[in-house]
């Protein structure tokens, strides 16, 4: 069971300081942006992180949403990352959900975060380069200290 606590507005960056945004095709991508670019591209660069308390002691659970015309929420259904048109719910009556990720500090790097899928244990949000695009994907952690699964989260309130 997951009960919502509150939400905040955030900019999410990978460790190369590229900014996460949702493109016109609703794809989550990373791109180099100045602070001015980041502001100009809002609301596509501003993510609503809704925090949830897990009824099991597994940590801080979050959903990641974006509000362009409508609110879309990040999902990892079938281990494929996509945005689905839905509001983050007040309650999720299950122990796993495709839209819930566990947000934790990276040990030894308190300002860096990682997001583990609640549906697929050991799978994390990651940045991966595919041709000329830097995509947000779901990736199995295969090595300690993997920088691709680490992010910074900056409050925008």
């Amino acid at each position: 069971y997951f009960g919502k606590l509150e939400s905040k507005l955030s900019v999410i960056r990978n460790l190369n300081d590229q900014v996460l945004f949702i493109d016109q095709g609703n794809r989550p991508l990373f791109e180099d942006m100045t602070d001015s670019d980041c502001r100009d591209n809002a609301p596509r660069t501003i993510f609503i992180i809704s925090m949830y308390k897990d009824s099991q002691p597994r940590g801080m659970a979050v959903t990641i949403s974006v509000k362009c015309e409508k609110i879309s929420t990040l999902s990892c259904e079938n281990k494929i990352i996509s945005f689905k048109e839905m509001n983050p719910p007040d309650n999720i009556k299950d122990t796993k959900s495709d839209i819930i990720f566990f947000q934790r500090s990276v040990p030894g790097h308190d300002n860096k975060m990682q997001f583990e899928s609640s549906s697929y244990e050991g799978y994390f949000l990651a940045c991966e380069k595919e041709r000329d695009l830097f995509k947000l994907i779901l990736k199995k952690e295969d090595e300690l200290g993997d920088r691709s699964i680490m992010f910074t989260v900056q409050n925008e309130d």
């Epitope: 606590l5 939400s7 007040d90 934790r104 409050n155």
Partner: antibody
């Protein structure tokens, strides 16, 4: 202006019951988890109980689990704490609080507290 | 759930700096960046000084700063002033069955 106003405190005998209320104004009550925090005379702060935005998730300190029940009515912007089987060690000022978990826009707010005295 | 551990008291002279520690576990302070610090004067409700480890709400003096290393968070007050004399509490989100946990509290005396 944000306000949290507690009511319902007073004197109660050991083993008795009491219900605290907290009326919120000045922010969107339904968007935030709420908590009760208490402070015994001359002692430190103790988190007592919390409730999720929709009321479906309820959380308790070990010291009150099974005796206290937290609830909320978002249509009335009101938070409740039902306290049963009260003990002398439950004597404290009870604060209604919206702790600032994150950098959320509405801030961190506390009521002025209501005193609960458990004594025969 | 156990309270976070703080020193019972600290003291300093006006103009000096002091640091108050707050030690928890990987289930609270060490696992999350949701650590807050509160100041409480006698008979008053707590006032937020720091949230998310090191962020200051608007209106709070920049003499107050927060940091974290591992399972220990710290509050530093620089340029101590007489009005800083108060009790200070840390708090953290916890992944245990409860939601928050407070520190044991530290009484600051300005000499």
């Amino acid at each position: 202006e944000v306000q949290l106003v507690e009511s319902g405190g007073g004197l109660v005998q050991p083993g008795g019951s009491m219900r605290l209320s907290c009326t919120a104004s000045g922010f969107t009550f339904s968007e935030y988890a709420m908590s009760w925090v208490r402070q015994a005379p001359g002692k430190g702060l103790e988190w007592v109980s919390g409730i999720s935005t929709g009321g479906g998730g309820t959380y308790y300190a070990d010291s009150v689990e099974g005796r206290f029940t937290i609830s909320r009515d978002n249509s009335k912007n009101t938070l409740y704490l039902q306290m049963n089987s009260l003990r002398a060690e439950d004597t404290a000022v009870y604060y209604c609080a919206k702790p600032w978990l994150s950098g959320s826009r509405s801030g961190d707010f506390w009521g002025q507290g209501t005193l609960v005295t458990v004594s025969s | 759930q156990s309270a976070l551990t703080q020193p019972a008291s600290v003291s300093g002279s006006p103009g000096q700096s002091i640091t108050i520690s707050c030690t928890g576990t990987s289930s609270d302070v060490g696992g999350y960046n949701y650590v807050s610090w509160y100041q409480q004067h006698p008979g008053k409700a707590p006032k937020l000084l720091i949230y998310e480890v090191s962020h200051r709400p608007s209106g709070v003096s920049d003499r107050f700063s927060g940091s974290k290393s591992g399972n220990t968070a710290s509050l530093t007050i620089s340029g101590l002033q007489a009005e800083d004399e108060a009790d200070y509490y840390c708090s953290s989100f916890t992944s245990s069955s409860s939601l928050y946990v407070f520190g044991t509290g530290t009484k600051l005396t300005v000499l």
